[in-house]
Amino acid sequence: FVRTKIDTTENLLNTEVHSSPAQRWSMQVPPEVSAEAGDAAVLPCTFTHPHRHYDGPLTAIWRAGEPYAGPQVFRCAAARGSELCQTALSLHGRFRLLGNPRRNDLSLRVERLALADDRRYFCRVEFAGDVHDRYESRHGVRLHVTAAPRIVNISVLPSPAHAFRALCTAEGEPPPALAWSGPALGNSLAAVRSPREGHGHLVTAELPALTHDGRYTCTAANSLGRSEASVYLFRFHGASGAST
């Protein structure tokens, strides 16, 4: 007989204490964890369950994006009676269980954070053996990854009528402000498209018409720092070509 229960409540505070003798399933996760790109972060997750002294096989799972159906980023399994949860999956080798599932702790450490890790994560525990039961966090914990700006692309492109335009794309969190400077420009915020659709941390700024030869510099800045990159425009006057 395989039985499973979902409790409709999910506690968002790690401090909540359950003292009732007949525990119900619940999970305690914070709403959000913040960390900087390149650093490590800990995603806390503790749970209570109704199966007193459960000692059978268990699996701990973390998934990203959406509960129940999102892709797994971490999975480990502990054999009956064992406190060792043997890792079966760790995406890119960057996820490691900090907690002890036998002690109702599924907390996860994520190493070498990147902006792409900025998503919601959901913990899940599964029992099998004499007791079959599972429970998953419905709301999850949002991992908010911050990063100083980085210019990922800067280029000069041809426009109609032998003109040229410049594009600068930068990433960062908070999304950086972009500014162009160059010949006869001073400082220009220049048609910022921010952020790009489907690329939450990318910001693009365009200089629609480059009227003078010379060096054009794009500066990206947010609360964590600044970055700049330059392109050079040199046109062969009297001809239709250009050198950048």
């Epitope: 499973t4 129940y68 159906a69 999956l89 099998a128």
Partner: antibody, heavy 122, light 107 residues
């Protein structure tokens, strides 16, 4: 492309045997529980069997227990259903189905094969 | 075993109508319920899982609700492609069981 492709169905006499296969592609096969679900002509869906991602545990409907065996070869990304002592009431389209997000549990079946017809008749 | 009972067994409706299908479990299954759509000669397709979560790619006109023993699938505004048979299924305990199906026909 994420898909499941069943094969091995056909006509078999009562008491005979058949082995169904389900080839999976496009996902990490060993990470998910897999199941067989059948549908008799003009009837509804009936769960037949489930196997955990690593093959550690298998579960069966009472109607097939002792006659059918579910197995998987994770190195070949293939699920099997060995059907012995077949009866007329086993006549159905057999679907293999993937669990939505777990290697031990089938919270729901999010991916289905196209089905393979098994006819048991003399 | 847990029995799943769907109602109605069949329903006639027109494009644009709002349609509700109910599913009742013979015991408390918490939220472990899924809904599927099946068209003739085709495999079932997952619509809703864990009672209320829309499967990715499923149009937002499909929604699920309920917990315990009573569940509902609602199609807010019927489209021509929605005419099919719908099944509920519990995954609370093995043996997993399906409802008998609800055939949605064009009026």
């Amino acid at each position: 492309e994420v898909q499941l492709l069943e094969s091995g169905g056909g006509l078999v006499q009562p008491g005979g045997s058949l082995r169904l296969s389900c080839a999976a592609s496009g996902f990490t096969f060993s990470s998910y529980a897999m199941s067989w679900v059948r549908q008799a002509p003009g009837k509804g869906l009936e769960w037949v069997s489930t196997i955990t991602g690593g093959g550690e545990s298998t579960y069966y409907a009472d109607s097939v227990k002792g006659r059918f065996t579910i197995s998987r070869d994770n190195s070949k990304n293939t699920l099997y259903l060995q059907m012995n002592s077949l009866r007329a009431e086993d006549t159905a389209v057999y679907y293999c189905a993937k669990a939505i997000g777990s290697s031990w549990y089938s919270d729901a079946f999010d991916l289905w094969g196209q089905g393979t017809m098994v006819t048991v008749s003399s | 075993d847990i029995q799943m009972t769907q109602s109605p067994s069949s329903v006639s409706a027109s494009v644009g109508d709002r349609v509700t299908i109910t599913c009742r479990a013979s015991q408390d299954i918490s939220s472990w319920l899924a809904w599927y759509q099946q068209k003739p000669g085709k495999a079932p397709k997952l619509l809703i899982y864990v009672a209320s979560f829309e499967h990715r790619g499923v149009p937002s006109r499909f929604s699920g609700s309920g917990s315990g023993t009573d569940f509902t699938l609602t199609i807010s505004s019927l489209q021509p492609e929605d005419f099919a048979t719908y099944y509920c299924q519990q995954s609370y305990s093995i043996p997993y069981t399906f409802g008998q199906g609800t055939k949605l026909e064009i009026k």
